[in-house]
């Protein structure tokens, strides 16, 4: 969370940004809020990126002004125009690229004053794992699979019954490059599993951490998977 103050004469406004992460190939959001101003025509939003000449995006007088937009962002940006009056200056970024990572500035000018704040935007790939019982193996095993990660993550297994146990000797993890030659598919197999136990497969890089849980009993199979972005907010 970054809060910036701007001073214009006696006036300043608070601008707030949140460190966020973009999943390459998908759409992302660079979050920025400011003190609302009901006078839409008096609001100017400028997004800038460190090391890039020209603007990432500009919104003024109630509409986009892309005359100074840098070509790497052409056709890929939009603000939430209907939410500007309530103080939302967040930027939607289409088809996130690895090269979109960096430091961005959200600059705001309203009739109340002006202000800006920086945000760090990380890019990579992250996805939820699917965890399944693998009957193909010679002994009952669990297969944890996640389709898109970058940079290469670490993979670890844990179990509710054997807390603190090291499963590296009884698991096998592979990384397979996807067709676009950047992201990788992660597959990890845990061998010799027992029923009535909850197992967790944890996949983590510097951007995200994903966990898949599975509990197998004689009468039911319960699965969960979740993902959290790291260092955001």
């Amino acid at each position: 969370l970054i809060i910036g103050f701007g001073i214009s004469g006696k006036h300043f406004i608070t601008v707030t940004t949140f460190t966020s992460a973009g999943n390459i190939g998908e759409d992302g959001t660079l979050s920025c809020t400011f003190e609302p101003d009901i006078k839409l025509n008096g609001i100017v939003i400028q997004w800038l990126k460190e090391g890039i000449k020209g603007l990432v995006h500009e919104f003024k007088e109630g509409k986009d002004d892309l005359s100074q937009q840098h070509e790497m962002f052409r056709g890929r940006t939009a603000v939430f125009a209907d939410q500007v009056v309530v103080g939302n200056a967040s930027l939607r970024l289409k088809n996130v690229q690895l090269t979109d990572a960096g430091t961005y500035t959200c600059y705001i000018r309203t009739s109340k004053g002006k202000g800006n704040a920086n945000l760090e935007y990380k890019t990579g790939a992250f996805s939820m794992p699917e965890i399944n019982v693998d009957y193909n193996a010679s002994s009952e095993s669990l297969r944890c699979e996640a389709p898109r990660w970058f940079p290469q993550p670490t993979v670890a297994w844990a179990s509710q019954v054997d807390q603190g146990a090291n499963f590296s000797e009884v698991s096998n993890t592979s990384f397979e490059l996807n067709s676009e030659n950047v992201t990788m598919k992660v597959v990890s197999v845990l061998y010799n599993v027992t029923i009535n136990n909850t197992y967790s497969c944890m996949i983590e890089n510097d951007i995200a951490k994903a966990t898949g849980d599975i509990k197998v009993t004689d009468s039911e199979v319960k699965r969960r998977s979740q993902l959290q972005l790291l260092n955001s907010g």
Partner: antibody, heavy 130, light 107 residues
């Protein structure tokens, strides 16, 4: 969005094996994230989950049918199949193939997956009678 | 297996009415519940998942709420195309089970 079409005999004799195939179009059966499911509905009654299969071969069956059910996948034909053996009149039903997919929802700490049956075939009626 | 009980099993209502259907789970399932609509001779259609998340393309007059063991599906203003049978389904674990259904008919 994937589309599903069931096929197979509409009439099966008691004690024989019911065999149905589901053909997947507008999507690959071997892409991850989908569980290929079978669900049935007895005449005028509610829905019963039979089981599903993941492209890697992992299967999950309803314990009440497990001893009689086999679900398999043929990635080369983009199809998955249901076999239910030793059928009786109680197996007369409309059989649906469906996809179970993980749909993510936002949580305070990130995202969580909810596995939901979101695409269904049109259903095929199977009658068990001699 | 987790049992789901729906109430009422039959409901008679008029266009414009607010309709509420309840589903009880035999054990706590957090928010792992979905709602489906089925019309005669057709496959069920997903309306809501995660107890309250509206599936893409479903009209906003449909809403879901609840957590744990008690869940509700609400249709804020019943439309002619809403006369159908509604099922709840838990997403908590295998085997998946469905409620017995609620048939919504024209009064």
């Amino acid at each position: 969005q994937v589309q599903l079409q069931e096929s197979g005999p509409g009439l099966v004799k008691p004690s024989q094996t019911l065999s149905l195939t589901c053909t997947v179009s507008d999507g690959s059966i071997s892409s991850g994230g989908y569980y290929w499911s079978w669900i049935r509905q007895h005449p005028g009654k509610g829905l019963e989950w039979i089981g599903n299969i993941y492209y890697s071969g992992s299967t999950y069956y309803n314990p009440s049918l497990k001893s009689r059910v086999t679900i398999s996948v043929d990635t080369s034909k983009n199809q998955f199949s249901l076999k239910l053996n030793s059928v009786t009149a109680a197996d007369t039903a409309v059989y649906y193939c469906a996809t179970e997919k993980a749909l993510a929802t936002v949580t305070p700490s990130g995202y969580e997956n909810y596995y939901t049956v979101d695409v269904w075939g049109q259903g095929t009626t199977v009658t068990v009678s001699s | 297996d987790i049992q789901l009980t729906q109430s009422p099993s039959f409901l008679s209502a008029s266009v414009g009415d607010r309709v509420t259907i309840t589903c009880w789970a035999s054990q706590g399932i957090s928010s792992y519940l979905a709602w489906y609509q089925q019309k005669p001779g057709k496959a069920p259609k997903l309306l809501i998942y995660a107890a309250s998340t509206l599936q893409s393309g479903v009209p906003s007059r449909f809403s879901g709420s609840g957590s744990g063991t008690e869940f509700t599906l609400t249709i804020s203003s019943l439309q002619p195309e809403d006369f159908a049978t509604y099922y709840c389904q838990h997403l908590n674990s295998y085997p998946l089970t469905f409620g017995g259904g609620t048939k919504v008919e024209i009064k």
